[in-house]
């Protein structure tokens, strides 16, 4: 992951570059949040280990029409190698457990700030 | 060394403009997204404005919206504040603030010596 | 919007003392905190980051606690320099709000 190409971008883009500006559409998505989240949309819930970034786009893949996470679909294929499909999942989705996508967010979101102070960008 | 250095505070009537600029040096200002925080003589500190690293992302105190703009140009390393419609509460030491979203150590670590800025008839 | 409370709103306190000081929150900021020190005419000066982590060049006197929405701000041994406004900063939502301060005074 050495050479993302993020949403919109003229080049490729450093891992860190790339994490913070997901942690950055991912706040935005948090403070603009009016109404439900996707209109309350559920997605299974993820563990939050290597392979997530998949592990979250096969989730968050799923939901269709909602335009406030489109963006972030896109930011986080660049984070996954191989080419993600609705209804494909893998062993990382906690199958058992369904969590709204507002909620789903957070923990992303949380998540990825932990990582980005730990300086693991990849 | 990393700095922060603000300027273009001054004197200025009820209603009139005002161009705030913080010019950064010693890192790199790309990377940072940065903040604007004023404060009032003998009063407490508040943020005003928040801008991500490419421009993407604003967001203002409620006290200065549909004044105060925002804006940056990496270029330059400058981050600026337009002010609009000024007021007497507007009256204070302005700062700038480097920040990464609110993730990392470098979270409001480095400051400006900030820039007074008087509204007054 | 977040509200941060901060107390006591002063305290006069000797040379040696151990001080605390508490600042809490309206809401779960996680570790989105940070401690300033200011001192009048200058800018304010980071302490404490992630509400628990010391800044690089801070003394050890200095130390932080706390997650969700209740944090502590500790100085072991006061020192003469450290006589002035300390301020708690959340910076997990925007709005970004500080605390009120906590003024430190010479007994």
């Known amino acids: 992951l050495t050479c993302l190409g993020g949403f919109a971008s003229p080049g490729p883009v450093p891992p860190s570059t790339a994490l913070r500006e997901l942690i950055e559409e991912l706040v935005n998505i948090t403070q603009n949040q009016k109404a439900p989240l996707c209109n309350g949309s559920m997605v299974w819930s993820i563990n939050l280990t290597a392979g997530m970034y998949c592990a979250a786009l096969e989730s968050l893949i799923n939901v269709s029409g909602c335009s406030a996470i489109e963006k972030t679909q896109r930011m986080l294929s660049g984070f996954c190698p191989h080419k993600v499909s609705a209804g494909q999942f893998s062993s990382l989705h906690v199958r058992d457990t369904k969590i709204e996508v507002a909620q789903f967010v957070k923990d992303l979101l949380l998540h990825l700030k932990k990582l980005f102070r730990e300086g693991q960008f990849n | 060394e990393v700095q922060l250095v603000e300027s273009g505070g001054g004197l200025v009537k009820p209603g009139g403009s005002l161009r705030l600029s913080c010019a950064a040096s010693g890192f790199t200002f790309s990377s940072y997204s940065m903040n604007w925080v004023r404060q009032a003589p003998g009063k407490g500190l508040e943020w005003v404005s928040y801008i991500s690293t490419s421009n993407s992302y604003i967001y203002y105190a409620d006290s200065v919206k549909g004044r105060f703009t925002i804006s940056r140009d990496n270029a330059k390393n400058s981050l600026y504040l337009q002010m609009n419609s000024l007021r007497a509460e507007d009256t204070a030491v302005y700062y700038c603030?480097?920040?990464?979203?609110?993730?990392?150590?470098?979270?409001?670590?480095?400051w400006g010596q900030g820039t007074m800025v008087t509204v007054s008839s | 919007d977040i509200q941060m409370t901060q107390s006591p709103s002063s305290l006069s306190a000797s040379v040696g003392d151990r001080v605390t000081f508490t600042c809490r929150a309206s809401?779960?900021?996680?570790?989105?905190l940070g401690w300033y020190q200011q001192k009048p005419g200058k800018a304010p000066k980071r302490l404490i980051y992630?509400?628990?982590s010391l800044q690089s060049g801070v003394p050890s006197r200095f130390s932080g606690s706390g997650s969700g929405t209740e944090f502590t701000l500790t100085i072991s041994s006061l020192q003469p320099e450290d006589f002035a406004t300390y301020y708690c900063l959340q910076h997990n939502s925007y709005p970004f709000t500080f605390g009120p301060g906590t003024k430190v005074d010479i007994r």
């Open positions: 992630a509400a628990s």
């Open positions: 603030a480097r920040d990464q979203v609110g993730a990392t150590l470098d979270a409001f670590d480095i």
């Open positions: 809401q779960d900021i996680t570790d989105d």
